[in-house]
């Protein structure tokens, strides 16, 4: 048993049939020595006297709120959560496998640009008496500062007959310099509470590893004189890091219609600007990839043809 | 301390092109690595992030761009003395700051160049014959150093009388690799920032 | 299986005209790009044109412009390359070759010899 | 136009033995490169798009890379089908060129 927070106690339990559980000890956070009482959650039941409860923790029944009493007088509470290991590894039923980049991925991180500044989201199909609370850390052995905020439900989608729930979180590194050369990952730490049952989940990257380029910005298109071609131009996005001359991007330009099946005009460039074929009912698109290390390639910005 | 603005002229940086090969030979090599070494961990993820020039040279600090030295968190106190002279400079309006920054690029690239000399030799000796550096990646080194042409005391190849432990060595290639990818990239970033300005 | 099967083999005579089909069979005709590439004999590849099958939009390399005229047939998914004003450096071997992709290539055609003599 | 030159033009190796094959451009053209073999009297076929992308179907010992002037066609180990003419195209710009071809024999 450990503490998750004040009052609030996880029970890690093999889960299995007819297994032992753990045997925790509660104690009353008050002077008091006679005349104490305990029940668990709404239940008016007496469990116990003493300043002490001993319990058998083996199912969810036995977890929940614990409060000791005097005279009609609630003293203290300890709220216990169960963290589940089945066949030596931890559940992890809370939180959906995103299966990208590998399977067992719960969490998910990108980052903009080089600031220390990341974003990273997790996917569920509950939708009550849930809560999360996010750690961060540069190293873990000697851990350098990383501020969470709070995680927030970011959007919500139908899948099928489900609903899911995309809920994320915001972090920055404390004391980051865009060109440093990271040899420590960032960890990241999911605390998830449903009801009852605890869980937690990890993610270990280097920022390098989760860049995402916002989308280039201002798409411009020139047709060129006596000619099917057209030149597009646009510029590095906002919020990509400074100077571009030592940040670099590289593009893809695309130009193709509706389906993805359909015929293409497809040029790469290290410039903010490139000559195209463009189709009736087309669209010129375009995305940007840090250009000395391949990391995700942004979203695309795209323009019609016509 | 960090690049200054006044820098060659655009497009005149001998050195840009070199870098260019450089990163994508490292990286070729270490793609290369990942495949043949399959069974040993060599991912990103499964390694030890060792920088073998750390404390020996500060690349990062001394090429830091103007903009960024508003950063607290990207000035580093570590100073390092270096030696000042080189063809890459393609000017006299070239700093002392700009020369401590491609001095030490080569100190780098010279540290590389014994380690990945002295791994080769080892695992040339491998029965299995496994995996070996490609000698692309070895050259463009070289050539870079070439273009850089700072004088530099040469460092002895170490050698080493015990048998290898080939196990070990491809793993140390794996590090090794990682970590020099990661310096290519840096040193491509300040060859591209050299030759904007 | 995707197949570009060309016309025969022709003699032309200098300040003529010749004109070389290329049939497409597999896949929907109007869904490539289709190209024109000619190789003289021990000259490297040369990239003459391109037509786009469903608008008839085409683009000539300047160096062909004026003389050549690619075309295309939906209705049997053939296109044509016609080239007039024949001169004797103009014997070469002319293949089609097809893509979704615009800049490039991935199914050609066998080739078709064109000998300009008089 | 851009001007793509290839070296060697001629390449004798064993069977069995590796190839590389260098293609130059005449002024950056990115990743825009592609690779393609030639048999004489057959089609040619797509062995390499943009630089280093792998064609289905096209064994793994062909590999591309390179970006901006630089690039190079290897194939690993060459086997008795892969003696043939390899030639190297570029799609940044129009006209598309091509480089002359490299010839690989068997030494």
């Known amino acids: 048993i450990w503490e998750l927070k004040k009052d609030v106690y996880v029970v890690e339990l093999d889960w299995y049939p007819d297994a032992p559980g753990e045997m925790v000890v509660l104690t009353c956070d008050t002077p008091e020595e006679d005349g104490i009482t305990w029940t668990l959650d709404q239940s008016s039941e007496v469990l116990g006297s003493g300043k002490t409860l001993t319990i058998q923790v083996k199912e969810f029944g036995d977890a929940g709120q614990y409060t000791c009493h005097k005279g009609g007088e609630v003293l203290s509470h300890s709220l216990l959560l169960l963290h589940k290991k089945e066949d030596g590894i931890w559940s992890t039923d809370i939180l959906k496998d995103q299966k990208e980049p590998k399977n067992k991925t719960f969490l998910r991180c990108e980052a903009k640009n080089y600031s220390g500044r990341f974003t990273c989201w997790w996917l569920t199909t509950i939708s009550t008496d849930l809560t999360f609370s996010v750690k961060s850390s540069r190293g873990s052995s000697d851990p350098q500062g990383v501020t969470c905020g709070a995680a927030t439900l970011s959007a919500e989608r139908v899948r099928g007959d489900n609903k899911e729930y995309e809920y994320s979180v915001e972090c920055q590194e404390d004391s980051a310099c865009p060109a440093a050369e990271e040899s420590l990952p960032i960890e990241v730490m999911v605390d998830a509470v449903h009801k009852l049952k605890y869980e937690n989940y990890t993610s270990s990257f280097f920022i390098r590893d989760i860049i995402k380029p916002d989308p280039p910005k201002n798409l411009q298109l020139k047709p060129l004189k006596n000619s099917r071609q057209v030149e597009v131009s646009w510029e590095y996005p906002d919020t990509w890091s400074t100077p571009h001359s030592y940040f670099s991007l590289t593009f893809c330009v695309q130009v193709q219609g509706k389906s993805k099946r359909e015929k293409k005009d497809r040029v790469f460039t290290d410039k903010t600007s490139a000559t195209v074929i463009c189709r009736k009912n087309a669209s010129i698109s375009v995305r940007a990839q840090d250009r000395y290390y391949s990391s995700s390639w942004s979203e695309w910005a795209s323009v019609p043809c016509s | 301390r960090n690049l200054p603005v006044a820098t060659p002229d655009p497009g005149m940086f001998p050195c840009l092109h070199h870098s260019q090969n450089l990163l994508r030979a490292v990286s070729n090599m270490l793609q290369k690595a990942r495949q043949t070494l399959e069974f040993y961990p060599c991912t990103s993820e499964e390694i030890d992030h060792e920088d073998i020039t750390k404390d020996k040279t500060s690349t990062v600090e001394a090429c830091l761009p103007l903009e960024l030295t508003k950063n607290e968190s990207c000035l580093n106190s570590r100073e390092t003395s270096f030696i000042t002279n080189g063809s890459c400079l393609a000017s006299r309006k070239t700093s002392f700051m700009m020369a401590l920054c491609l001095s030490s690029i080569y100190e780098d690239l010279k540290m590389y160049q014994v380690e990945f000399k002295t791994m080769n030799a080892k695992l040339l000796m491998d029965p299995k014959r496994q995996i070996f550096l490609d000698q692309n990646m070895l050259a463009v080194i070289d050539e870079l150093m070439q273009a850089l042409n700072f004088n530099s005391e040469t460092v002895p190849q170490k050698s080493s009388l015990e048998e290898p432990d080939f196990y070990k060595t491809k793993i140390k290639l794996c590090i090794l690799l990682h970590a020099f990818r990661i310096r290519a990239v840096t040193i491509d970033r300040v060859m591209s920032y050299l030759n904007a300005s | 299986q995707v197949q570009l099967v060309q016309s025969g083999a022709e003699v032309k005579k200098p300040g003529s005209s010749v004109k070389v089909s290329c049939k497409a069979s597999?896949?929907?005709?109007?869904?490539?790009?289709l190209h024109w590439v000619r190789q003289a004999p021990g000259q490297g590849l040369e990239w003459m044109g391109w037509i786009d099958p469903e608008n008839g939009d085409t683009e000539y390399a300047p160096k062909f412009q004026g003389r050549v005229t690619i075309t295309a047939d939906e209705s049997t998914s053939t296109a044509y390359m016609e080239l007039s004003s024949l001169r004797s450096e103009d014997t070469a071997v002319y293949a089609c070759a097809r893509n979704k992709e615009l800049r490039y290539f991935d199914v050609w055609g066998q080739g078709t010899l064109v000998t300009v003599s008089s | 136009d851009i001007v793509m030159t290839q070296s060697p033009l001629s390449l004798p190796v064993t069977p069995g033995e590796p190839a590389s094959i260098s293609c130059r451009a005449s002024q950056s053209i990115s990743i825009n490169l592609h690779w393609y073999q030639q048999k004489p009297g057959q089609a040619a076929r797509l062995l390499i798009a943009f630089a280093s992308q792998s064609i289905s179907g096209v064994p793994s010992r062909f590999s591309g890379s390179g970006s901006g002037t630089d690039f190079t066609l290897t194939i690993s180990s060459l086997q008795p089908e892969d003696f043939a003419t390899y030639y190297c195209q570029q799609s940044n710009s129009f006209p598309l060129t091509f480089g002359q071809g490299t010839k690989v024999e068997i030494k």
């Open positions: 597999g896949g929907t005709f109007s869904d490539y790009y």
